[in-house]
Amino acid sequence: MKVLQEPTCVSDYMSISTCEWKMNGPTNCSTELRLLYQLVFLLSEAHTCIPENNGGAGCVCHLLMDDVVSADNYTLDLWAGQQLLWKGSFKPSEHVKPRAPGNLTVHTNVSDTLLLTWSNPYPPDNYLYNHLTYAVNIWSENDPADFRIYNVTYLEPSLRIAASTLKSGISYRARVRAWAQCYNTTWSEWSPSTKWHNSYREPFEQH
């Protein structure tokens, strides 16, 4: 049994880091493998992660952490029974993938303005809380070409757009994702999408 693709890990910078790797053949990850992880700290102890299958030869493990600070470093040991298959380390602050925003809501009762709001996925005491920026994706269910991205570079989790920038009388969907420049993170996953019917009064034509 050998590791074909070494574990790579990303952290949500809150409580979970996810590590993925590939074995050289079909593997029952949860029965055959264990990933031991330990914070490099005098009084820490090793924790065991039981991996799950992620495709035939792929494995994924969700490492639980109390919290994360920038100085944290973890040692990782991948075991198959008594055999050490791979040894490495992981610094969560250098491999951050933020949590996805939630509770995306489209408010259509503001006159001719669409107000999209969502929730910051972090609690106020987390470092990323004040460092997230967002991308909002809006697309038409009827027209695949009607697909747009709005970059929200301010901290407030909301976006206002004129309803008239979208076609009237058809249904749209929106979703949002986050990233943090301070840690050069990857983008989060997209939030669940939300749907609404876009309708607004056309202005009277002047003749």
Partner: antibody, heavy 116, light 111 residues
Framework: EVQLLESGGGLVQPGGSLRLSCAAS????????MAWVRQAPGKGLEWVSA????????YYADSVKGRFTISRDNSKNTLYLQMNSLRAEDTAVYYC?????????WGQGTLVTVSS | QSVLTQPPSASGTPGQRVTISCSGS????????FNWYQQLPGTAPKLLIY???HRPSGVPDRFSGSKSGTSASLAISGLRSEDEADYYC???????????LGGGTKLTVLG
């Protein structure tokens, strides 16, 4: 709410023994390392000993090595410090502290006086 | 003799910004993070800053920490009379498998 309550302090003669206890509540005791820190009257803080969450690893300051023993009972949510061969210079308030990277919660302390 | 050196005293007037230093000896390993504790008169110490610059919840943002090599600093801005206390720095020394604490700095708020 995290609470740490030390007990077992008192007056003891040089060469004598005492056992300090620290009762923990408000958090999952078995998931945290713990430590003892002391403060002699009018002096600064001095780290004494620390123990990992399972008790697998234990560390002592040179000044108490071989005389003090730290232990824990996770089923009772209690930390202990057995102090033998006590000296006058061990006179101090002894604090129990929870460890999360640093000493993030402290008890109110128990006074140990070593005097003849 | 502590391997972390702090000035024995510091002072400032209300509203001022005060900085307390904590210096490791030249041979002190610089891999560990610094922590800061506040001890108000007659009370148990309280964690103020951990991992160089992180504040536990409930600690006002007037308190901030920084690290440079084997030294650290605690800054208190908008000084208040209730900040009058002893301040200690500390760090894990992995070469000695121990926790080392500075000698403490007594902060006096004047006026």
């Amino acid at each position: 709410e995290v609470q740490l309550l030390e007990s077992g302090g008192g007056l003891v003669q040089p060469g004598g023994s005492l056992r300090l206890s620290c009762a923990a509540s408000g958090f999952t005791f078995s998931r945290h390392a713990m430590a003892w820190v002391r403060q002699a009257p009018g002096k600064g803080l001095e780290w004494v000993s620390a123990i990992t969450m399972s008790g697998r690893s234990i560390y002592y300051a040179d000044s108490v090595k071989g005389r003090f023993t730290i232990s824990r009972d996770n089923s009772k949510n209690t930390l202990y410090l057995q102090m033998n061969s006590l000296r006058a210079e061990d006179t101090a308030v002894y604090y129990c502290a929870r460890v999360h990277r640093a000493f993030d919660y402290w008890g109110q302390g128990t006074l140990v006086t070593v005097s003849s | 003799q502590s391997v972390l050196t702090q000035p024995p005293s510091a002072s400032g007037t209300p509203g001022q910004r005060v900085t307390i230093s904590c210096s490791g000896s030249p041979l002190f390993p610089d891999s560990g993070s610094f922590n800061w504790y506040q001890q108000l008169p007659g009370t148990a110490p309280k964690l103020l800053i951990y991992a160089d610059s992180h504040r536990p919840s409930g600690v006002p943002d007037r308190f901030s920490g920084s690290k440079s090599g084997t030294s650290a600093s605690l800054a208190i801005s908008g000084l208040r009379s209730e900040d009058e206390a002893d301040y200690y720095c500390g760090t894990w020394d992995y070469s000695l498998n121990s926790y080392v604490l500075g000698g403490g700095t007594k902060l006096t708020v004047l006026g």
